[in-house]
Amino acid sequence: AQEVQQSPHCTTVPVGASVNITCSTSGGLRGIYLRQLGPQPQDIIYYEDGVVPTTDRRFRGRIDFSGSQDNLTITMHRLQLSDTGTYTCQAITEVNVYGSGTLVLVTEEQSQGWHRCSDAPPRASALPAPPTGSALPDPQTASALPDPPAASALP
C-alpha cells in the first residue's frame, strides 16, 4: 500500500522559531494537504504542482514551501503557542493516504526543558486517522474508499 513518509515525528521549538515538516510519497500523487488535527481539525495548506498553494489565513505569510508535491518540505515560521499540535500530511492519490503526523510543541523559551519529544516515532499508515466531527460532507459512506478524518476545507 502507498504510504506517506512524514518527518520529524516530534519537535520542540521556542516561540518565534520555525519548523520544517517534510512529506514524501512514492508517486501517483495528485495533491497534498497539511492538516492540523484536534477537536476542530483544519487544513493548513493545500499544495499541488503547478498550482498556487493555498494557505489558511492563520498561517498566511508564515509558510514557505520547497521541493515538489512528491517530496514537499513545509516551513512554518514565527510559531506561536497556539500553533502547538499534531500536523499530518494527507496525500490525494487514488484513495486518501495519511502520514504519521508531526507533533509540534511550541514553548516559552524559559520552559523548554520541561517539554521534550519522545524518541519513538509513530508509524506512517495508509489507514485514515480517527474521524472527528465536522461540518463538511462524508462521501466515503458505503463506498470502496477508506473513511477519512473530518476537517474543514481551506478558507
Epitope: 495528485r30 495533491g31 494537504y33 487544513d43 493545500y46 499541488e48 504542482d49 503547478g50 498550482v51 493555498t54 494527507q90 490525494i92 486518501n96 465536522s134 461540518a135 463538511l136 460532507p137 462524508d138 462521501p139 466515503q140 459512506t141 474508499l145 473513511d147 477519512p148 473530518a150 476537517a151 474543514s152 476545507a153 481551506l154 478558507p155
Partner: nanobody
C-alpha cells in the same frame, strides 16, 4: 450549511450522452478535491471520477475514456460529461468532497440508460 445540488440526469438510450452538474455551497469549494459517485439499486456507492483544485483527474477503468470531470471554481460547480452511455451506467449520481469531510449527501440525480 453545506449544500450539494446535483442536476442534469435523465433517460437516455445506450450510446447517448448526458452532462451532470453539481452546485456546491457551505464550504471552500475551490480548495476541495471533488468526486462524482454513483449508486445503482442494491449496489455500493462507487467513485466514478474525481478532480483536484488544479484539475488533475482520475477515473476507474469502467468509465475511463467515456466520462470527463471538470470544474468551474468561480461558479462553485463541478461537471460530469458522460458519453457512450451503457445500460450498466444506470444509477443515482452524487457529487461530494473526495476526502469525506463530514456526513452530508445531496439528493443526487437519476441517470437511466435504457433502450
Amino acid at each position: 450549511a453545506v449544500q450539494l445540488v446535483e442536476s442534469g440526469g435523465g433517460l437516455v438510450q445506450p450510446g447517448g450522452s448526458l452532462r451532470l452538474s453539481c452546485a456546491a455551497s457551505g464550504f471552500t469549494f475551490s480548495n476541495a478535491v471533488i468526486g462524482w459517485y454513483r449508486q445503482a439499486p442494491g449496489k455500493q456507492r462507487e467513485l466514478v471520477a474525481s478532480i483536484t483544485p488544479g484539475g488533475r483527474t482520475t477515473y476507474p477503468d469502467s468509465v475511463k475514456g467515456r466520462f470527463i470531470i471538470s470544474r468551474d471554481n468561480a461558479k462553485n460547480t463541478v461537471y460530469l460529461e458522460m458519453n457512450s452511455l451503457k445500460l450498466e451506467d444506470t444509477a443515482v449520481y452524487y457529487c461530494n468532497d473526495f476526502r469525506g469531510l463530514g456526513g452530508y449527501w445531496g439528493q443526487g440525480t437519476q441517470v437511466t440508460v435504457s433502450s
